[in-house]
């Protein structure tokens, strides 16, 4: 069966939107009005992995682009990147682990934990216009809580 996917946007708990920053990075900033069109639309695919009531494995692709968020070691540190894939083969139900995030719902907020690197989360900073990154702390200065907005296909 084909993998189930939905289109959505994400905002952090400060209401910052996610936009492209160069070809292989995302950044977070406050958008309003027409600028909202800049925000990236994700194709969130529901993939194979360890699942529970509040934890669902997903892959986060950029809609109509052959780019997926992935988690890799760079200089011995878990790092978030946008990775190009062959569109003929993706998305798929059994995604490589670096593409998989555990979507965790807590109090109507979402966290995205790397399946490859447990306790590392998609994170943004309090500051405006700074990169989205993989952070190893929760509940500190860095923001790990998001809300999801559904986008019609």
């Amino acid at each position: 069966a084909p993998v189930r996917s939905l289109n959505c946007t994400l905002r952090d708990s400060q209401q910052k939107s996610l936009v492209m920053s160069g070809p292989y990075e995302l950044k977070a900033l406050h958008l309003q009005g027409q600028d909202m069109e800049q925000q990236v639309v994700f194709s969130m695919s529901f993939v194979q992995g360890e699942e529970s009531n509040d934890k669902i494995p997903v892959a986060l692709g950029l809609k109509e682009k052959n780019l997926y968020l992935s988690c890799v070691l760079k200089d011995d540190k878990p790092t978030l990147q946008l990775e190009s894939v062959d569109p003929k083969n993706y998305p798929k139900k059994k995604m490589e682990k670096r593409f998989v995030f555990n979507k965790i719902e807590i109090n109507n907020k979402l966290e995205f934990e790397s399946a490859q690197f447990p306790n590392w989360y998609i994170s943004t900073s309090q500051a405006e216009n700074m990169p989205v990154f993989l952070g190893g702390t929760k509940g500190g200065q860095d923001i790990t809580d998001f809300t999801m907005q559904f986008v019609s296909s």
């Epitope: 900073s125 990169p131 990154f133 702390t137 200065q141």
Partner: antibody, heavy 118, light 107 residues
Framework: EVQLLESGGGLVQPGGSLRLSCAAS????????MFWVRQAPGKGLEWVSV????????RYADSVKGRFTISRDNSKNTLYLQMNSLRAEDTAVYYC???????????WGQGTLVTVSS | DIQMTQSPSSVSASVGDRLTIICRAS??????LAWYQQTPGNAPKLLIH???SLQSGVPSRFSGSGSGTDFTLTINSLQPEDFATYYC?????????FGGGTKVEIK
């Protein structure tokens, strides 16, 4: 008053290492992104590296990637730049700067000179 | 990487002149542009951020305009302390990049 004071520069041989420090005062250091920017003698400005307030996010210019490491100690209000495998082309005045709204440098230190020469 | 090109690279002007410096980005940087002033032997000083916003404490004779790829710094009525080198810098994406600088000299 915001103050940034760099130290640790000097003369070093090619292949050698140096660690620069930047002591911050007059603002809540732990809340700000910080940059290192350098300027070779008689040349323009070159961005080197950035670190987030928590230290969780860092980025580097391609010219220093794999050789330089940015870090910070918020308990000491100090920013660092560990510079390894130094080359002649790393010779420059190194400035630390506080990051303002959206990615500008709103306050700068006075700079510290690094000279890489045999 | 985004390339930033400044023009002119140097200019001679007199006290009281109106001066315009141009900065062009190799791709759209929205309004994520800053302007700095640097005098010999000193660190750069932020003049303008977000393309048009005057940094606190900077005289109102300095102004910035533009968005997308084309930006200008205007100095109305040059003062003796304005003879310096000016740099633009994009903050749209990392690596951050500066223009090559514009040296403003006394005619």
């Amino acid at each position: 008053e915001v103050q940034l004071l760099e130290s640790g520069g000097g003369l070093v041989q090619p292949g050698g290492s140096l660690r620069l420090s930047c002591a911050a005062s007059g603002f809540t250091f732990s809340k700000y992104f910080m940059f290192w920017v350098r300027q070779a003698p008689g040349k323009g400005l070159e961005w080197v590296s950035v670190i987030s307030p928590s230290g969780g996010m860092t980025r580097y210019a391609d010219s220093v990637k794999g050789r330089f490491t940015i870090s910070r100690d918020n308990s000491k209000n100090t920013l660092y730049l560990q510079m390894n495998s130094l080359r002649a082309e790393d010779t420059a005045v190194y400035y630390c700067a506080r990051v303002g709204y959206g990615g500008n440098s709103d306050y700068w230190g006075q700079g510290t000179l690094v000279t890489v020469s045999s | 990487d985004i390339q930033m090109t400044q023009s002119p690279s140097s200019v001679s002007a007199s006290v009281g002149d109106r001066l315009t410096i141009i900065c062009r980005a190799s791709q759209d940087i929205n309004r994520w542009l800053a302007w700095y002033q640097q005098t010999p032997g000193n660190a750069p000083k932020l003049l303008i951020h977000s393309a048009t916003s005057l940094q606190s404490g900077v005289p109102s004779r300095f102004s910035g305009s533009g968005s997308g790829t084309d930006f200008t710094l205007t100095i109305n009525s040059l003062q003796p302390e304005d003879f310096a080198t000016y740099y633009c810098q994009q903050a749209e994406s990392f690596p951050l990049t500066f223009g090559g600088g514009t040296k403003v000299e006394i005619k």
